[in-house]
Every structure is written in C-alpha cells, then in structure tokens.
C-alpha cells in the first residue's frame, strides 16, 4: 500500500499541532504521525514497510520541512513496533508504535496529544482536523510546511456501501468524507483530531483521494487502548 | 540531483506498439506521482495519465484510455508508457515529468510505413 | 471537462517591457499551474497553485488570479523569457492545459 495527502486543505498555524510527527526514511518525509507520550510517536504500520535497510527517524516540532525552526528536533527510533495482526496487504490494525531514542524536550511546539479511550463511534458530522506534509493536489506536489483540512466524519453504513468500501470497514476503522478535502498519499499515520483528542490514524491502503465515493479510512485509536497501553508500559 | 532520463526516439509501424522508458534517480518515484505528457508536432501540451507507483493506480485521459498504458517498476525506479495500435496521430514526442516539477529530455516518437 | 483558452496566442515585447498573459478557464479552478517552453527543451514549471514561484525561477514571473480568470506576468521582459507559456488547471479531472501563448522578443 502507498503512504497515505492533504488535498483541498491549507497550510496550518505554524505549530498549533505541537503533537505532529513526520516521520522520517533516509532524511525524507515518509509519513505522519502524533505524539502520544514523551518518548513515543503513533503512525501507521504500512509506513515501514520498505525501510528495512534504511534510517527511520522522527521529527518533532517542526512546521517547515527544510527551514531552521528553534524547535525543531530529529530523533532516532530506539524501537519500531507494528501491531501484531497488521498485515502488508489489508488495512487493518495498520498501527505502529515508535519509541524515541529519549524522551522529547517538551515546549510550546512540542506537546504529546491525548488519545481516545472510550471506545465509542465519532458522531457522523462531527467536524475533524487531519494534518499532514502529504501531497497537495493531484499533480502530486509536495508541501513543506505543514497542511490540515476539516473533515466531516462519515456514519459506517454509508462507507460501507458496495460504491464506497464495499463492508471493509470494520468496527476498528472509521471514516471521514473526502470530496474534494481529503488526507492522502504522505498522510499516512497522521492525527485525526475530534474535539481536541486524538481518534483516529490515517490508514496508508490503496484509495483514490479526494474522491467522495473513496473516503478516507481512519484507524480508530480506542479501539487499540489496551495494545496501546500495553506497549507504552 | 533529480533527474529523469528517457528512452532514444522510436520509429515504428502504423498497427505496432511501443513502450517509452523514464528512468529516475535522485528520488524516490513510490513518494510520488509520476506523470506523462505529449507534444504533437506544432502543437501545444496534452496531459496523457499518471501513475501512483507505490500501489500501481493510474489514472488516464479519456483520448488516451485504451491507447495509453502507465506503469512503473519500483525496484528500477522506472516509469513505462506503452501506446498501442499506432497511427499517423500517436507521432508526438512524449514527456515523462515527476509531478510537474521535473521532467524529462522528451521521446520523439514517428509512425510511419 | 474544464478548457482553458489562453489569450493572445502570439505576442511580443520589447526588453525590459512588462508582459501580461491570461488563461481563462470554462469553470473555477484554484490549482493552476504555468509553464514555460522553449523550441526543441522540455516544458519547465514556472508557477504552481495560481501564485508559487517554482524553484530556481527569477522573481520577475509572477501569476494571479481567481475562480475562471488566471494570469501570467513578467515584470521586466528579458530575452531569454522567449517562448510559449501554457497553462494548466490540476482542479477536474480530466487535467487540462491551455493551447499556449507564444512570447517573441521585439
């Protein structure tokens, strides 16, 4: 599966979102992620799936990609841990725990993101942040500083339909409308942001962007709390 | 550097295919979208598809679906346009571009008996 | 599907002049894209979502515009700015370009 883009969004505050994560293959963007504890950064288990002889690494604080930010800071992974039942060829279960090599130095542009853990459905309509140094139109460009649009989260039975997902998505994975707004190739493992908590990780599966029949598939972080808690023990 | 190289011009038959090359490097074609282009003599630029080589998704222009195949080997990071049952109005060259940002030298392609 | 028609086809212009281009499109789009093309090279990206200036291209390019109208400006014209300018909207698919204008120096 590719790395999951923001399409149709716009680039954020600078380092309002002081959870996001890019990580990182040789030096380059590969995909997003959120900081959920001091040392350890949630993504999407896809993200590594090609990097077994290269160096992943995690930049915390940066809104710019390649500009000098004071706050910006690269860590080295100590540990990378996909969920156990996440497999190359689905979208389920497609999260992934990476420990930093320390503990990150904590400021106003560096913030861990509480996690939801009551395992309860997003209201359909409920307006949600999705950010990402993804793609940004559907040429392909890529974005340097950091992008975010607002999705409307999307009821399960209608992302379902046969001309949506056809019943792929399951009680673990929530959907958000993407007409023409959509997260996407670059986005993967990035934050869905509900109400100032963290819902759900943008899946890295095969999909169409900013195709309102094709919306976009989040893994739903309640869903996963006891492997969550269980790894960051 | 990024760079695309691409395959040495191609005279072919009326009725024949071809399979133009774009050779990357200095990037990562599977963070991308790679995309072709075509330019008949004297005209101007005509979008042709784009492939997403990370999961093979392509997308065609509606003059160019079933004339055009896209594909990509990402172990060589290459990008293939093949053209199929040529005629007199397929002679172009043919651009591959990373994006739109970079492109290639271009492939002169005849079609003549 | 959306068609940008570009306005004039030819012009010229005296070194140091500004020049002005249109692109204006059948329906609103908001990704526009501009590129430039000199006779026997490859197209080269000069703008990209309307107002960007691609990397490495002099400042004295500069695109505008909203909804159906676009435009392409030089600010001072140099001699190597001879060429023919296309547009291009990245908004519906399929993604189109305009027929070109063709810039020659006076």
């Known amino acids: 599966p590719p790395r999951g883009r923001i399409l149709g969004g716009r680039e954020a505050e600078a380092h309002a979102r002081p959870y996001m994560a890019s990580v990182q293959l040789n030096g380059a963007h590969l995909c997003g992620g959120v900081l959920v504890a001091e040392q350890w950064v949630l993504s999407a288990a896809h993200c590594l799936e090609d990097a077994a002889d290269g160096k992943v690494q995690v930049l915390l604080g940066a809104h710019s990609l390649s500009q000098p930010e004071p706050s910006k800071r690269l860590y080295d992974v100590l540990r990378a841990v996909p969920h156990p039942d996440s497999q190359p060829d689905t979208i389920d279960h497609d999260l992934l725990l990476l420990q930093l090599s320390e503990k990150a130095t904590l400021g106003p542009a560096v913030r861990p993101l509480p996690w939801q853990r009551v395992d309860r459905d997003v209201a359909p309509g409920t307006l949600c942040d999705v950010a990402g140094w993804g793609i940004v139109n559907h040429a392909g460009r890529r974005p340097d500083s950091l992008q975010h649009v607002l999705l409307p989260v999307l009821d399960r039975a209608t992302c379902n339909r046969r001309t949506h997902h056809d019943g792929a998505i399951t009680e673990r994975l929530m959907c958000a409308e993407s007409n023409r707004r959509d997260s996407c190739k670059g986005d993967s493992g990035g934050p869905l942001v509900c109400g100032g908590v963290l819902e759900g990780v943008v899946t890295s599966g095969s999909r169409v962007c900013g195709n309102r029949k094709k919306p976009g598939i989040y893994t739903r972080v309640a869903s996963y709390a006891a492997w969550i808690d269980s790894v960051l023990a | 550097e990024v760079q695309l190289q691409q395959s040495v011009a191609e005279l072919v038959r009326p009725g024949a295919s071809v399979k133009l090359s774009c050779s990357a490097s200095g990037f990562n074609i599977k963070n991308t979208y790679m995309h072709w282009v075509n330019q008949r003599p004297e005209q101007g630029l005509e979008w042709i598809g784009r492939?997403?080589?990370?999961?093979?998704?392509?997308k065609y222009a509606p003059n160019f679906q079933g004339k055009a195949t896209i594909t990509a080997d990402t172990s060589s990071n290459t990008a293939y346009l093949q053209l199929s049952n040529l005629t007199s109005e397929d002679t172009a060259i043919y651009y591959c571009?990373?994006?739109?940002?970079?492109w290639g030298q271009g492939t002169s392609v005849t079609v003549s008996s | 599907q959306i068609v940008l028609t570009q306005s004039p086809a030819i012009m010229s212009a005296s070194p140091g002049e500004k020049v002005t281009m249109t692109c204006s499109a059948s329906s609103s789009v908001s990704y526009m894209y501009w590129y430039q093309q000199k006779p026997g090279s490859s197209p080269r990206l000069l703008i990209y979502d309307i107002s960007n200036l691609a990397s490495g291209v002099p400042v004295r390019f500069s695109g505008s515009g909203s909804g159906t109208s676009y435009s392409l400006t030089i600010s001072r014209m140099e001699a190597e700015d001879a060429a023919t300018y296309y547009c291009?909207?990245?908004?519906?698919?399929?993604?189109?370009f305009g027929g070109g204008t063709k810039l020659e120096i006076k």
């Open positions: 571009t990373r994006a739109m940002d970079y």
């Open positions: 492939i997403d080589p990370a999961n093979g998704i392509t």
């Open positions: 291009q909207q990245w908004d519906t698919y399929p993604w189109t």
